[in-house]
C-alpha cells in the first residue's frame, strides 16, 4: 500500500534545502518548475544551512518533524477532512502550522519566528539554531528574494504533487 | 501556547541518534533514565549514522517526517482519540506506524525493514540508505544490544515525557 502523505513535494524541497546538497535541490526545484529567481532565492536559504553546519540541518529537521506530527497539524487535518475520514482517507494539503512557520521564517521578525518554533520545541539549542538561521536568511535575502521564495511555496502548495 | 505533540521524547532521542552528536544523545538518554547497557546499544545505532555520513541523517529524517505526517499516523491518532478530539485535544502516544518501523529496524530482516520504509518513501536513494543503516545495525549489535534498545524504547513509549 502506498500511503498518502501531506504534500510530499514540500518535504522533498525542505529536506533538499536543509540537506545542503545543491544537486538534490536543483532536482527538486526542477520538479516544481521553479523560475530562475525562485531558484536563486532557495539557494540562498540553503547557503544558511550549509554555513551553519550539520547541527542546523538536524535540529531543523527535528522542528519540522515535531510540527508535522503535532496536535496542531493532526487537529487541522482532522477538522478539515471529517467527511474524508469516514471513508478512511486524509487530505494531502500542507498543514497550516507548517505553512505559518515557513511564512514567519521568511517574512516575520527573528523574535516572531523563534516564538513560533518555541511553541513546538523549546530546547534552548533548537531555539538558538532557529535564530541563527533566521538572522542568516534576513542578511542574505533581499525583499525580492523572499517574495520569490514565497511564490515558489505557493506553487508547491497548489501543485498536483502536493 | 505550548502544543502537545506525539511523544516528543521519542523524537528527541531519534534525532539525537541520527544527528551523530553523542553529547545530545547522552542528554536525551539521561532524561529517560537509560541504563548502561541501553546507552551502549543506542550508541551503536548512532555509530551507524555517523559512519554512513550526513546523507543518512538527512534521509532518515525525511523518512521519519514522512511517516509521522502520513495518513497512517494521522488516521491512527484520530481513530485512537475520537473522544479527545471532541474536547480539541489529541493523544500524545507514538504513532503505531512509527513504532512498527523502529521495531523492524531492530528485529526484522533488511528486506522487511526496507519494505516498510518503501510504503512511505520509495525514492531509491532513501531505500538504499535504509538498507545500509539496517545492515550496519545488524553487524554491530548483538541480540542482547537489540533487546536493550527495545527495552529503552518501551521505557520511552511509557514515559511521562511521551
Amino acid at each position: 500500500v502506498k500511503m498518502a502523505e501531506t504534500c510530499p513535494i514540500f518535504y522533498d524541497v525542505f529536506f533538499a534545502v536543509a540537506n545542503g546538497n545543491e544537486l538534490l535541490l536543483d532536482l527538486s526545484l526542477t520538479k516544481v518548475n521553479a523560475t530562475e529567481p525562485e531558484r536563486t532565492a532557495m539557494k540562498k536559504i540553503q547557503d544558511c544551512y550549509v554555513e551553519n553546519g550539520l547541527i542546523s540541518r538536524v535540529l531543523d529537521g527535528l522542528v519540522m518533524t515535531t510540527i508535522s506530527s503535532s496536535k496542531d497539524c493532526m487537529g487541522e487535518a482532522v477538522q478539515n477532512t471529517v467527511e474524508d475520514l469516514k471513508l478512511n482517507t486524509l487530505g494531502r494539503e500542507i498543514c497550516p502550522a507548517v505553512k505559518r512557520g515557513v511564512d514567519l521564517f521568511l517574512t516575520g521578525t527573528p523574535d516572531e519566528y523563534v516564538e513560533q518554533v518555541a511553541q513546538y520545541k523549546a530546547l534552548p539549542v533548537v531555539l538558538e539554531n532557529a535564530r541563527i538561521l533566521k538572522n542568516c536568511v534576513d542578511a542574505k535575502m533581499t525583499e525580492e528574494d523572499k517574495e520569490n521564495a514565497l511564490s515558489l511555496l505557493d506553487k508547491i502548495y497548489t501543485s498536483p504533487l502536493c | 501556547v505550548k502544543m502537545a505533540e506525539t511523544c516528543p521524547i521519542f523524537y528527541d532521542v531519534f534525532f539525537a541518534v541520527a544527528n551523530g552528536n553523542e553529547l545530545l544523545l547522552d542528554l536525551s538518554l539521561t532524561k529517560v533514565n537509560a541504563t548502561e547497557p541501553e546507552r551502549t546499544a543506542m550508541k551503536k545505532i548512532q555509530d551507524c549514522y555517523v559512519e554512513n555520513g550526513l546523507i543518512s541523517r538527512v534521509l532518515d529524517g525525511l523518512v521519519m517526517t514522512t511517516i509521522s505526517s502520513s495518513k497512517d499516523c494521522m488516521g491512527e491518532a484520530v481513530q485512537n482519540t475520537v473522544e479527545d478530539l471532541k474536547l480539541n485535544t489529541l493523544g500524545r502516544e507514538i504513532c503505531p506506524a512509527v513504532k512498527r518501523g523502529v521495531d523492524l529496524f531492530l528485529t526484522g530482516t533488511p528486506d522487511e525493514y526496507v519494505e516498510q520504509v518503501a510504503q512511505y518513501k520509495a525514492l531509491p536513494v532513501v531505500l538504499e540508505n535504509a538498507r545500509i543503516l539496517k545492515n550496519c545495525v545488524d553487524a554491530k549489535m548483538t541480540e542482547e544490544d537489540k533487546e536493550n534498545a527495545l527495552s529503552l524504547l518501551d521505557k520511552i513509549y511509557t514515559s511521562p515525557l511521551c
Epitope: 545543491e22 544537486l23 536543483d26 532536482l27 539557494k43 550549509v50 | 525514492l123
Partner: antibody, heavy 115, light 107 residues
C-alpha cells in the same frame, strides 16, 4: 535562445585521457544543474554525470565513477568532463544537456577509444 | 536504480496513423518522466516533460499521459518527419535512466 556547444572529442588509446567542454549561452548558467549524456554507436542513451548550479555537488554513473570528473566554470559559462582511464566501451557521442529532463541538448562530440 | 522499459521496441506505421508508445518504470516515479525524439546522426529533441507537459514549439499531435509506473506517448497523426526513435527518461531520482527506445519506421 539556449545554445550548448560541445568540443574536445577525438580518438584516444585505451587508458588515455580526454577533456570535453560544453560552452553554454542564452540562459543564466549558474542557476541550473548541467549534465552529460552519452550514446554508444547504434545504442541507446545513457546518463553519465551531473553537477549542481554552483558546482557544490556532483554525481556520476557507476560505469564511470572514479574515472570521470564533471566540473564547471560559471565565469566562463562552460561545463567540463575530464575522462581518465578510458576504455573501448566509453566510445560514444557525448552530449551536454540542461535541466534534469534534458530540455536542451548540444550537438554532441564523438569520443573514440581504440588502439 | 530505477529501470525503464519501453514497448514496442519497434513499430511500422503509415502516414496519418495514430500510434502509442508505452514506457514502464520499475517503481513509482510520480510524473517525473520525459520523452525524446531522435533522428539518425542528430541530438535527441525534448518533446514532453512532467509526463504530459509539451515543450514549447512541439506540435500538439504529440501527447503524453500516465503517472506512477505506467506512461504513454501518443502521436495522433503520423507525418513523414515523425519517423524516428523515441526514448523515455525518468528524473525522479539519481541516477537518471532512459528506456531502450522505440524505433518508428514507415510501413
Amino acid at each position: 535562445e539556449v545554445q550548448l556547444v560541445e568540443s574536445g572529442g577525438g580518438l584516444v588509446q585505451p587508458g588515455g585521457s580526454l577533456r570535453l567542454s560544453c560552452a553554454a549561452s542564452g540562459f543564466t548558467f549558474s542557476t541550473y544543474a548541467m549534465h552529460w549524456v552519452r550514446q554508444a554507436p547504434g545504442k541507446g542513451l545513457e546518463w553519465v554525470s551531473s553537477i549542481s548550479g554552483r558546482g557544490r555537488n556532483s554525481d556520476h554513473a557507476d560505469s564511470v565513477k572514479g574515472r570521470f570528473t564533471i566540473s564547471r566554470d560559471n565565469s566562463k559559462n562552460t561545463l567540463y568532463l575530464q575522462m581518465n582511464s578510458l576504455r573501448a566501451e566509453d566510445t560514444a557521442v557525448y552530449y551536454c544537456a540542461r535541466t534534469e529532463y534534458f530540455h536542451h541538448w548540444g550537438q554532441g562530440t564523438l569520443v573514440t577509444v581504440s588502439s | 536504480d530505477i529501470q525503464m522499459t519501453q514497448s514496442p521496441s519497434s513499430l511500422s506505421a503509415s502516414v496519418g496513423d495514430r500510434i502509442t508508445i508505452t514506457c514502464r518504470a520499475s517503481q513509482d516515479i510520480n510524473n517525473y518522466l520525459a520523452w525524446f525524439q531522435q533522428k539518425p546522426g542528430k541530438a535527441p529533441k525534448s518533446l514532453i516533460y512532467g509526463a504530459s507537459s509539451l515543450q514549447s514549439g512541439v506540435p500538439s499531435k504529440f501527447s503524453g499521459s500516465g503517472s506512477g509506473t505506467d506512461f504513454t506517448l501518443t502521436i495522433s497523426s503520423l507525418q513523414p518527419e515523425d519517423f524516428a526513435t523515441y526514448y523515455c527518461q525518468q528524473y525522479s531520482s539519481y541516477p537518471f535512466t532512459f528506456g531502450p527506445g522505440t524505433k518508428v519506421d514507415i510501413k
